[in-house]
């Protein structure tokens, strides 16, 4: 994760008896919630691996970096971080591995400085479309988020609701056009089978997109054309068979792009010819010399850069009258 870690060693732990006695009052300047460690010098609060079942109510107003990892939060309700006075300085929030399965509309409202949010390693079966936008208006107030880390948020297969997980995540990313300023989006390890057509066009500020370790088979309907700021595109460890001309041209047209394509099951038949030609010419693919064929069997482990057009044939399709049973 890209959330910052504290460099300060001056952490103070709270006494357990402070737990909820003052939760209804504004926190004292130097107060630290029960089961947390606080460093005012580093503007950091860490409530890590403490089996917390709710977000502490008495977070200090100075907090800039908040780690709530390894807990038992289950649900983030609306206004989970809304406080009086507000947590106006909170810029980085890490909630990874806290067994969240439900994030409700407006969960991150009243955090005007929130730039980095990490929800990785939570089985998010119920992510509200308005989790990040805070309202169901067609155009919401812009979110301050710049980095959104959503790696491994897919629930186990037997725990998923009967709906498209990809669709649920994308709805939250696009609601109200609130994330127009997002620069880093990580969606690795989520079993994505496809990328909904509109998602990238509506995130025009993206610099870094990580879709590694999913199950993407094709990028045919995905357009990268609008992502003129994109610097890194991670597509390693997917199920990609070939990249077609339209995708190749769009990637080549991005001025700052680096693309990562390792560990995909490339099919080295006649449909691969354009991609091989492009790979030989392009500078945008990192580690392109490591890309190898997976199919057909006779081509397995052949290096794509070493192929020529004679290697890339398709078995002829016999007319029905000549096919054998």
């Amino acid at each position: 994760s890209s959330s910052p870690t504290s460099s300060a060693s001056s952490f103070s732990s709270s006494a357990p008896f402070l737990a909820s006695a003052v939760s209804a009052q504004p926190p004292l300047p130097d107060q630290c919630p029960a089961l947390c460690e606080c460093s005012e010098a580093a503007r950091t609060v860490k409530c890590v691996n403490r089996n917390l079942t709710e977000v502490p109510t008495d977070l200090p107003a100075y907090v800039r970096n908040l780690f709530l990892t390894g807990n038992q939060l289950a649900v983030l309700p609306a206004g989970a971080f809304a406080r009086r006075p507000p947590l106006a300085e909170l810029a980085a929030l890490n909630l990874s591995g806290s067994r969240l399965d439900e994030v409700r509309a407006g969960a991150f409202e009243h955090l005007p400085s929130l730039r980095q949010l990490d929800l990785s390693h939570n089985p998010l079966a119920d992510l509200s479309p308005f989790a990040f936008s805070g309202s169901n208006a067609s155009v919401s107030a812009p979110s301050p988020l710049v980095e959104l880390i959503l790696n491994h948020i897919v629930p186990p297969e037997d725990e998923r609701q009967n709906r498209s997980f990809e669709g649920m995540v994308v709805a939250a990313l696009l609601a109200g056009r609130a994330l127009q300023g997002l620069r880093r989006l990580e969606l690795a390890s989520n079993h994505f089978l496809y990328l909904p057509r509109d998602v990238l066009a509506q995130l025009p500020s993206l610099r870094h997109l990580d879709l590694s370790n999913n199950s993407l088979v094709s990028l045919t309907y995905v357009s990268f054309r609008n992502l003129t700021h994109l610097e890194s595109l991670h597509l390693e460890d997917n199920a990609l068979k070939v990249l077609h001309n339209g995708t190749l041209a769009e990637l080549q047209g991005l001025p700052h792009i680096r693309v990562f394509l390792d560990n995909n099951p490339w099919v080295c038949d006649c449909h691969m010819a354009d991609m091989v030609t492009w790979l030989k010419e392009t500078e945008v693919v990192q580690g392109k010399d490591r890309l190898t064929c997976a199919y057909p069997e006779k081509m397995r482990n052949r290096v794509l850069l070493e192929l020529n057009s004679a290697d890339l044939d398709c078995d002829p399709i016999l007319p029905p009258s000549l096919q054998t049973s």
Epitope: N51, T53, Q72, L73, A74, V75, S98, R99, L100, D101, E102, N122, P123, A125, D126, P155, E159, Q161
Partner: nanobody, 122 residues
Framework: EVQLVESGGGEVQPGGSLRLSCAAS????????MAWFRQAPGKEREFVAA????????RYAESVKGRFTISRDNAKNTVYLQMSSLRAEDTAVYYC???????????????WGQGTLVTVKP
């Protein structure tokens, strides 16, 4: 409406262990949380522990932390309460409940079982 059936109650000596089970007639998709409550004679019904069907987050009453463990088996639509180091004050009727919220209040839960009696005595 989901039917909840508790089992596993009985009489045990102080320091002993019991495992309660709560079988749901079907996976209660509308109920995201399963919980155990208990009611001792002449006392209010009190929260013991809860678990989420998805993700398996757990929470416990302070009085049972470190002694009781709640778990769930999604394939069997069943929730368990492993109780160890039992004390006389754990004597109560134990109820299984299902609800939407991630709460500890009686009102957070809409579906209830009939209860199973746990008696701890020398």
């Amino acid at each position: 409406e989901v039917q909840l059936v508790e089992s596993g109650g009985g009489e045990v000596q102080p320091g002993g262990s019991l495992r309660l089970s709560c079988a749901a007639s079907r996976r209660p998709f509308s109920s995201k949380t399963m919980a155990w409550f208990r009611q001792a004679p002449g006392k209010e019904r009190e929260f013991v522990a809860a678990v989420r069907w998805i993700g398996g987050a757990t929470r416990y009453a302070e009085s049972v932390k470190g002694r009781f463990t709640i778990s769930r088996d999604n394939a069997k639509n069943t929730v368990y309460l492993q109780m160890s180091s039992l004390r006389a004050e754990d004597t109560a009727v134990y109820y299984c409940a299902a609800g939407q919220a991630w709460g500890t209040k009686f009102t957070d839960y809409s579906d209830w079982g009939q209860g199973t009696l746990v008696t701890v005595k020398p």
